[in-house]
Interface confidence: low
């Protein structure tokens, strides 16, 4: 009987290590074996690995890689997810504030128009929210519907309160007259311009953030190919088959393997860089009438001014509409009664400005600065993963996939792998279909962002005049480009100290009879919008 093999001839170390990966030792040889069935860790001499172990190593290597990729993108992913949620919530809060300001304006200045006005305002702001979230609604239609709905109520309640009930079936005629006679002057057009510009930009901003999440999620959950799994196994685990438990892969070798495994992912880099830069351009242009916070929170004042405009022209309008809507068949003659000399108020519209202490715009800029630190995220991924996985420093005495070497040489490694999977093959394959799809989506959003930001496109025109809107926004008749200080209105100050104050507590239209004053307040507001619950929003 031969003497027992010396300690270094057993597979004891390999067995104890492998047991951590796979409880049970049935797959691990007790003593080294020839390894003729191995396909990845092609041995130089005896090995402590079996085919089953190799398969387990491959699976573990791919899982390791997925985890490394996920941890690499964790900070970036959290940054975008958190901000997308924060901005979506904040935009909803702005809409809610705007609705409450508008309802408060009606309640305080035109109580006779409530609750119908509340209903129309509610519908308008619901549409605004839906539009921001991507619904296929036309902003001009939303604004027209608001004014079309408001005018019959204004006419019957404010301008002609003594109208007999028999005359109250003229709503359709009044809706039509509203546009034909331009009873609100150029206010509807002004609101259309401002709201559509600010909402369009807000919507694309949210879309871009959500696509950012999709990009990260896609690359985060990539399933690495079997070829990559073999390369990783060779790099991380084949040394164990040799009983080399403490040795680390060579740094250069790791970079080559990672570049090969991530060739498809790295192709995103160009489009990712463009995405961040385009998003930055968009954000830089999101101010004044391109900032929905400014625009929506100032709407109540503009709507108030538009009603004052109607009231100032009430005399002439009542006469004209009296003739026009006396009989519904006279509708076709409406334009003949257009009054030429309506009273024009020469005030200038001021878009409500927010104090930029902790506003949405400062939060947006902060996000862009953080995103810019991730501009090289995809090109740096292979290096990042190597630096966050065990590799030998300075390539001294390291594992090159086959043996211990003092310095990694790509050429030597490739020559020594004649019968093994070639590193080069990995790079020749195109990106995975999911990566190609996400690249297409990035191209599309980048194109949209560029269109939004291009000066020629005039969507984010930075040549804004003093009052915050483009010359020409109000048509040829600059006199109708009016607005006012909103006599008797509440000053909108510090509307959204971002993330400190939240949704306005009182929904005026939920409780028209409520004794609380439904006026915008500066003090702290404490309604909490849906603490992360997906089931239903806070009522």
């Amino acid at each position: 009987q031969p003497p027992p093999p010396p300690p270094d001839a057993t597979c004891h170390q390999v067995r104890s290590f492998f047991q951590r990966l796979q409880p049970g030792l049935k797959w691990v040889p007790e003593t080294p074996v020839p390894g003729s069935d191995l396909q990845v860790c092609l041995p130089k001499g005896p090995t402590c690995c079996s085919r089953k172990m190799e398969e387990k190593y491959q699976l573990t290597a791919r899982l390791n890689m997925e985890q490394l990729l996920q941890s690499a993108s964790m900070e970036l992913k959290f940054l975008i997810i958190q901000n997308a949620a924060v901005f979506q919530e904040a935009f909803e809060i702005v809409v809610r504030h705007a609705k409450n300001y508008t309802n408060a304006m009606f309640k305080n200045n035109y109580p006779s128009l409530t609750p119908q006005a509340f209903e129309f305002v509610g519908e308008f702001f619901t549409d605004v929210s839906l539009y921001i979230l991507g619904s296929d609604i036309n902003v001009d239609d939303m604004v027209n519907e608001l004014f079309d709905s408001l005018f019959p109520v204004i006419y019957t309640q404010l301008m002609n309160p003594g109208l007999p009930d028999s005359a109250l079936d003229i709503n359709e005629c009044l809706r039509g007259a509203r546009r034909d006679l331009k009873v609100f002057g150029n206010f509807p057009k002004l609101i259309m311009t401002q709201v559509s510009k600010s909402l369009q930009v807000t919507r694309i901003f949210l879309q871009a953030l959500n696509l950012g999440i999709e990009v990260i999620n896609t690359t985060d959950h990539l399933k690495f190919s079997k070829d990559c799994g073999r390369m990783l196994t060779r790099m991380w685990y084949c040394s164990y088959c040799q009983g080399l438990m403490m040795v680390k892969p060579c740094g250069g070798y790791c970079n080559v393997v990672m570049q090969g495994c991530m060739a498809g992912v790295v192709e995103i880099d160009k489009y990712w860089r463009e995405y961040i830069l385009s998003l930055e351009e968009l954000v830089n242009g999101m101010y004044r009438i391109y900032d929905m916070e400014n625009v929506l929170l100032g709407l109540f004042s503009t709507i108030h001014d538009s009603i004052q405009y109607v009231q100032k022209n009430a005399g002439k309008l009542t006469t004209t509409i009296g003739k026009l809507c006396a009989h519904s068949q006279q509708r076709q003659y409406r334009s003949a009664y257009y009054p030429e000399d309506l009273f024009i108020d020469k005030k200038v519209l001021k878009v409500a400005h927010v104090e930029h202490e902790e506003t949405l715009s400062s939060r947006r800029r902060e996000l862009i600065q953080k995103l810019k630190s991730f501009i090289s995220f995809y090109s740096a991924l292979p290096g990042y993963i190597c630096s966050h996985s065990p590799v030998a420093e300075n390539d001294t005495l390291c594992w090159n996939g086959q043996e211990l070497v003092e310095r990694y040489s790509q050429k030597a490694a490739r020559n020594g792998m004649k019968n093994q999977f070639n590193l080069h093959e990995l790079k020749m394959k195109g990106p995975e279909p999911v990566v190609s799809q996400i690249i297409d989506k990035l191209k599309h959003i980048n194109q949209l962002l560029r269109t939004m930001s291009m000066p020629k496109g005039r969507v984010l025109d930075k040549n804004l005049d003093e009052e915050g809107f483009e010359s020409g926004d109000c048509g040829d008749d600059e006199d109708e480009c009016i607005g006012g200080s909103g006599d008797g209105m509440i000053k909108v100050k510090n509307q959204l100290r971002f993330l400190a104050e939240l949704a306005y507590d009182l929904d005026v239209d939920d409780a028209p009879g409520n004794s609380q004053q439904a006026t915008p307040k500066d003090n702290e507001i404490s309604t909490f919008h849906n603490l992360g619950n997906v089931h239903s929003p806070l009522k």
Epitope: L499, L502, L531, G532
Partner: antibody, heavy 119, light 107 residues
Framework: DVKLVESGGGLVKLGGSLKLSCAAS????????MSWVRQTPEKRLDLVAA????????YYPDTVKGRFTISRDNAKNTLYLQMNSLKSEDTALYYC????????????WGQGTSVTVSS | DIVMTQSQKFMSTSIRDRVNITCKAS??????VAWYQQRPGQSPKLLIY???NRYSGVPDRFTGSGSGTDFTLTISNMQSEDLTSYFC?????????FGVGTKLELK
């Protein structure tokens, strides 16, 4: 190991004030929504206040609105509840609670701190 | 506010029994319901979330079911350590509300 340790409870006069603290450890505090839940002597559980992960948004039921303030210091891993104008019905055991990461259920509760409002 | 009604404040049971604790919501809450166990002198512990998902570390004898307004916590093989109080909670809308609790007692 997730730990939530409340402090600051005690006996307080009607109309008085008290500030509760909750020291969190064993998890990334800034990633979680947190709440204060109280349990009355009759063992009824009530949500007192809730706060989102970055501390910018808070919810209060009508029973405490205007009197209680929830806040958090993510740098210190601490949740707070400032209670003013205390009423006898505020007498309860106050729990600091963590919300489950992907749901609004409450997956970790502290041991509670007792608040007694006396006349 | 949504009222969560646990009609049985006390329930008598035996070891190894199958016990059904019910909870009724005053309006549809989908599956936004959690169940908690509270032992005397201890804080509540999460057992079930989203009506039927068992929280990690909870023994598989505890199962949750239901959606809409009617919910059930089932303990399939009653153990002595399960003789304690159980609360349901809805988180479909604010304020999050709890049932008054059901205390299990030995027959």
């Amino acid at each position: 190991d997730v730990k939530l340790v409340e402090s600051g409870g005690g006996l307080v006069k009607l109309g008085g004030s008290l500030k509760l603290s909750c020291a969190a450890s064993g998890f990334t505090f800034s990633s979680y929504y947190m709440s204060w839940v109280r349990q009355t002597p009759e063992k009824r559980l009530d949500l007192v206040a809730a706060i989102n992960f970055y501390g910018g948004l808070a919810y209060y039921p009508d029973t405490v609105k205007g009197r209680f303030t929830i806040s958090r210091d993510n740098a210190k891993n601490t949740l707070y509840l400032q209670m003013n104008s205390l009423k006898s019905e505020d007498t309860a055991l106050y729990y600091c609670v963590r919300h489950y990461r992907y749901d609004n259920a409450m997956d970790y509760w502290g041991q509670g701190t007792s608040v007694t409002v006396s006349s | 506010d949504i009222v969560m009604t646990q009609s049985q404040k006390f329930m008598s049971t035996s070891i190894r029994d199958r016990v059904n604790i019910t909870c009724k919501a005053s309006q549809n809450v989908g599956t936004a319901v959690a169940w908690y166990q509270q032992r005397p002198g201890q804080s509540p512990k999460l057992l079930i979330y989203s009506a039927s998902n068992r929280y990690s570390g909870v023994p598989d004898r505890f199962t949750g079911s239901g959606s809409g307004t009617d919910f059930t916590l089932t303990i399939s093989n009653m153990q002595s350590e399960d003789l304690t109080s159980y609360f349901c909670q809805q988180y479909s809308s604010y304020p999050l509300t709890f049932g008054v609790g059901t205390k299990l007692e030995l027959k």
